[in-house]
Interface confidence: low
């Protein structure tokens, strides 16, 4: 999916109001310095591409992020503010309906969510911070 035509400010607002807090809740009890950020992005569409990949694509050692609250809200924000995004995600939605109960959070998942926090920070990075 090409994220170029998303309403970035609306997505930013969704992140600031809820998604960021859910990410912090997920990472609670983890030191902010525990993981080094190895994933980055160069502009807002690129950031959303990386965020989608890390949030919804299962990886070795961390298959369950798509079931987390922050992931649900991320999916909703993208569906609402990125034209045509929902249509590309039908298969992913069907797969999520079959979800099991959440497993124990693995260190790999914590590391992945730490990377997500960094990507979201990059996405929201203002030219001039808002008061």
């Amino acid at each position: 999916y090409d994220f170029t035509n998303c309403d970035f400010e609306k997505i930013k607002a969704a992140y600031l109001s809820t998604i960021s807090k859910d990410l912090i809740t997920y990472m609670s009890g983890t030191k902010s310095t525990e993981f080094n950020n190895t994933v980055s992005c160069s502009n807002r569409p690129h950031c959303l591409t990386e965020i989608q990949s890390l949030t919804f694509n299962p990886t070795a050692g961390c298959a369950s992020l798509a079931k987390e609250m922050f992931a649900m809200k991320t999916k909703a924000a993208l569906a609402i503010w990125c034209p045509g995004y929902s249509e590309t995600q039908i298969n992913a939605t069907q797969a999520m309906k079959k979800r099991r109960k959440r497993k124990v959070t693995t260190n790999k998942c914590l590391e992945q969510v730490s990377q997500l926090q960094g990507l979201w920070r990059r996405f929201n990075r203002p030219l001039l911070k808002q008061q």
């Epitope: 160069s42 502009n43 920070r121 990059r122 990075r125 030219l127 001039l128 911070k129 808002q130 008061q131």
Partner: antibody, heavy 122, light 108 residues
Framework: QMQLVESGGGVVQPGRSLRLSCAAS????????MHWVRQAPGKGLEWVAV????????HYADSVKGRFTITRDNSKNTLNLQMNSLRAEDTAVYYC???????????????WGQGTMVTVSS | SYVLTQPPSVSVAPGETATITCGGN??????VHWYQQKPGQAPVLVIY???DRPARIPERFSGSNSGNTATLTISRVEAGDEADYYC???????????FGGGTKLTVL
């Protein structure tokens, strides 16, 4: 190994010109904004100029505007600073500096050269 | 253009906490970066975007920024931390990078 190496410094008389160069290696030079920063002997850091990653924009400190010109050659991984109408107050160590670029804002300087000394004296 | 004000010097005993401030009009609205410079060496980035720490910078270094003051805090200060420290912001109004005057940290 990521590296920035400055050259071209030296002693020059007031009113004359000097051209500094900076050779970059070990990273994707064309994707970074590049700056010159200077430091007069015993003084603090002073930002001089920036050129965007693609050369599309340049900005200068008021103290050098109209006298200094920053350019880059992405095919050769080089940064240049053409300094004209030099003054005694331009005497300083000149650092070539790399900064990731985010939209149109300049970011923190994450890689510095070791600097080249420019002395303007009669 | 935008002005950043730092105290010329700060002294602290080994093992104590050093606090270096950087004042500017509504500096909390800007992203602040901090550099360490030891004699005869090029500066090194120690804190960027107010609070983030580059790899290889000890956890003892931290930053904060709100209102009219940004702060660099060095906990459990060591002799090797003795250096000049500079704050920096990008001034979007004038498209210029601005440095503070620098603070000399002395470890007693």
């Amino acid at each position: 190994q990521m590296q920035l190496v400055e050259s071209g410094g030296g002693v020059v008389q007031p009113g004359r010109s000097l051209r500094l160069s900076c050779a970059a290696s070990g990273f994707a030079f064309r994707t970074y904004g590049m700056h010159w920063v200077r430091q007069a002997p015993g003084k603090g850091l002073e930002w001089v100029a920036v050129i965007w990653y693609d050369g599309s924009a340049t900005h200068y400190a008021d103290s050098v505007k109209g006298r200094f010109t920053i350019t880059r050659d992405n095919s050769k991984n080089t940064l240049n600073l053409q300094m004209n109408s030099l003054r005694a107050e331009d005497t300083a160590v000149y650092y070539c500096v790399r900064a990731p670029q985010w939209y149109l804002s300049a970011e923190a300087f994450d890689l510095w050269g070791q600097g080249t000394m420019v002395t303007v004296s009669s | 253009s935008y002005v950043l004000t730092q105290p010329p010097s700060v002294s602290v005993a080994p093992g104590e906490t050093a606090t270096i401030t950087c004042g500017g009009n509504l500096i909390g609205a800007y992203l602040v970066h901090w550099y360490q410079q030891k004699p005869g060496q090029a500066p090194v980035l120690v804190i960027y975007d107010d609070v983030d720490r580059p790899a290889r910078i000890p956890e003892r270094f931290s930053g904060s920024n709100s209102g009219n003051t940004a702060t660099l805090t060095i906990s459990r200060v060591e002799a090797g931390d003795e250096a000049d420290y500079y704050c920096q912001v990008w001034d979007h109004d004038t498209n210029t990078m601005v440095f503070g005057g620098g603070t000399k940290l002395t470890v007693l």
